[in-house]
């Protein structure tokens, strides 16, 4: 019985993507369950470099170097076959990172998106890379890939990520490679955390004492809601960063994070998110703009306004 | 604009050894591989292999494993390539080139191999 | 490891002619292929990448076109600084090849 139904199924468990130094478990599956297999990497050769070693369950390969890097295939052990063994399996990428200098990762328009809209992700450097590739922290599917353009000393690629939706929400991170060891990754961009805002009703923002203030008095935003939301960002149009603060249930039934801005130098207008702690990268509905303004205070020039930046970690659990 | 300048001709006796320099310029240099390529008299070019100026980790081609060895200095941007035990037939040009298609090379630095 | 066939190894072209130097691949290489001049005394120059990417700076009569195992370098019209040895090299796998040269001299 050769073919589909006798070829098991490779894969690779965190992920495709290995750093160097790093372990990765290859796992044989077959419908029927194998106890046994067998490892070959695709080199133009086609020789098992596992020199006829026979596995159980799952290999866990590693400390994985460039060489590691490539395409395997399994067979499972089957007793009563005329080989004695199945048919190879899918092909499998395994592709080690850390080989050249990080790229560049930017979205645009920016990383805070509403729902159904469409970012492009740009993977760049000034190392020319022949491919760039965009990898989604937590998943274990292959990364896009995209052969990339030089221009003017610089090599980049494109990805466009759309229409969004909560399962597109994440990190992201893109690597590059270049031609004659296309699966030998250099080092990751820094992460670039994508947000989907819209998906839930906005939350509701106040400050205290007031929204008009003294120069030097302390306020308080007050940012709430009678959804159950885990975590509050708290936004001002020209900062590149939010806060974030973990939401706690009020006795009248609502849930609700003060974010002390301290002592009033500068006014600005802020915006509130709420999210759940399942999908910290999915926010709601942003929160009315509220416009603080400080009294007093000759020097109330802001900075052009940006989009919030979400650079640093927003999609990773707050503890 | 972006240079790669090698060291001078060198004249060795079999068995010695020759340290070839090829210092870079113009550019980051732990951007782009450095590959090192061998023109014999009268011959055409030979590939002899590259290092990973990155990683520090060099690759060397088939003809070109045990005698040869590259090298990096990063902090000096140079790059470099060594032969032991010298022999006759290694006398040639040999060049330092740069990036995955040999976008720039070096002058070439003839080393002559003789009694 | 690939093997790169270049022909002709050697020809005679007058000034203004179009001339054609071509590579032939062992096996496929995709478009990894470069075309370089190399001249006494001087070091060489790459000319194309890509297989039809011209590097800055390199004159628009040299061209280069193909894929997959078949390769050429194309100059519209020559000139007399053109004259040289030509390679074409293959960086789609590691040994990278180099094709055994053509020498193009002026009639």
């Known amino acids: 019985l050769m073919g589909g139904q006798d070829k098991p199924f490779l894969s690779a468990r965190p992920s495709t993507v290995v750093p160097r130094g790093g372990h990765v478990a290859l796992q044989c599956h077959y419908r029927r369950g194998f106890n046994n297999f067998m490892l070959y990497k695709e080199d133009r050769s086609h020789v098992p470099i596992f020199h006829g070693r026979i596995f159980q369950e799952s290999f866990i390969m590693g400390p994985v170097t460039p060489a590691h890097a490539g395409t395997y295939r399994c067979r499972g052990s089957r007793p009563h076959s005329l080989t004695g063994w199945s048919a190879p399996s899918n092909p499998l990428v395994i592709m080690v990172t850390g080989n050249h200098r990080k790229p560049s990762l930017l979205a645009h328009p920016g990383p805070l998106l509403k729902s159904g809209e469409t970012v492009i992700l740009q993977c760049w450097s000034d190392v020319m890379f022949e491919h760039f590739f965009l990898h989604k922290e937590g998943i274990s599917k292959d990364p896009s890939r995209l052969v990339g353009q030089i221009h003017d000393g610089v090599s980049k690629a494109n990805f466009s990520i759309g229409p969004l939706m909560p399962v597109l929400a994440g990190t992201y991170r893109c690597y590059g490679s270049v031609p004659h060891s296309p699966y030998q990754l250099s080092a990751p961009s820094d992460p670039l955390d994508i947000v989907i805002t819209g998906l839930y009703e906005k939350p509701s923002l106040s400050a205290q004492p007031g929204p008009t203030v003294q120069a030097g008095e302390n306020v308080t935003l007050s940012c709430s809601s009678w959804s159950s939301y885990d975590i509050y960002h708290l936004s001002r149009e020209g900062e590149a960063h939010e806060r974030r603060l973990r939401a706690v249930p009020k006795v009248n039934r609502t849930f609700q994070a003060d974010f002390p801005l301290g002592p009033a130098t500068h006014g600005g207008t802020y915006r509130c998110f709420g999210s759940f702690r399942a999908l910290p990268c999915v926010w709601s509905n942003s929160s009315d703009p509220l416009l603080v303004s400080v009294t007093g205070n000759p020097s109330s020039s802001w900075p052009s306004p940006t989009e919030p930046s979400s650079k640093s970690g927003i999609c990773r659990h707050l503890h | 604009q972006i240079q790669l300048v090698q060291s001078g001709p060198e004249l060795k006796n079999p068995g010695e050894t020759v340290k070839i320099s090829c210092k870079a310029s113009?550019?980051?240099?732990?951007?782009?591989?450095m590959n090192w390529v061998k023109q014999a008299p009268g011959k055409g070019l030979k590939w002899m292999g590259w290092?990973?100026?990155?990683?520090?980790?060099?690759t060397y081609a088939d003809d070109f494993k045990g005698r040869f060895a590259f090298s990096l200095e990063t902090s000096a941007s140079t790059a470099y390539l060594q032969i032991n035990n010298l022999k006759n037939e290694d006398t040639a040009t040999y060049f330092c080139?740069?990036?995955?298609?040999?976008?720039?090379w070096g002058q070439g630095t003839l080393v002559t191999v003789s009694t | 490891d690939i093997k790169m066939t270049q022909s002709p190894s050697s020809m005679y072209a007058s000034l203004g002619e179009r001339v054609t130097i071509t590579c032939k691949a062992s096996q496929d290489i995709n478009s990894y292929l470069s075309w370089f001049q190399l001249k006494p005394g001087k070091s060489p120059k790459t000319l194309i990448y890509?297989?039809?990417r011209l590097v800055d700076g390199v004159p628009s009569r040299f061209s280069g076109s193909g894929s997959g195992q078949d390769f050429s370098l194309t100059i519209s019209s020559l000139e007399c600084e053109d004259m040289g040895i030509y390679y074409c090299?293959?960086?789609?796998?590691?040994?990278?090849?180099f094709g055994g040269g053509t020498t193009l001299e002026i009639k």
């Open positions: 080139a740069h990036g995955p298609w040999l976008a720039y």
């Open positions: 890509r297989a039809n």
């Open positions: 113009g550019y980051i240099f732990t951007n782009y591989g």
């Open positions: 290092i990973n100026t990155y990683t520090g980790e060099p």
């Open positions: 090299l293959q960086y789609d796998e590691l040994p990278y090849t």
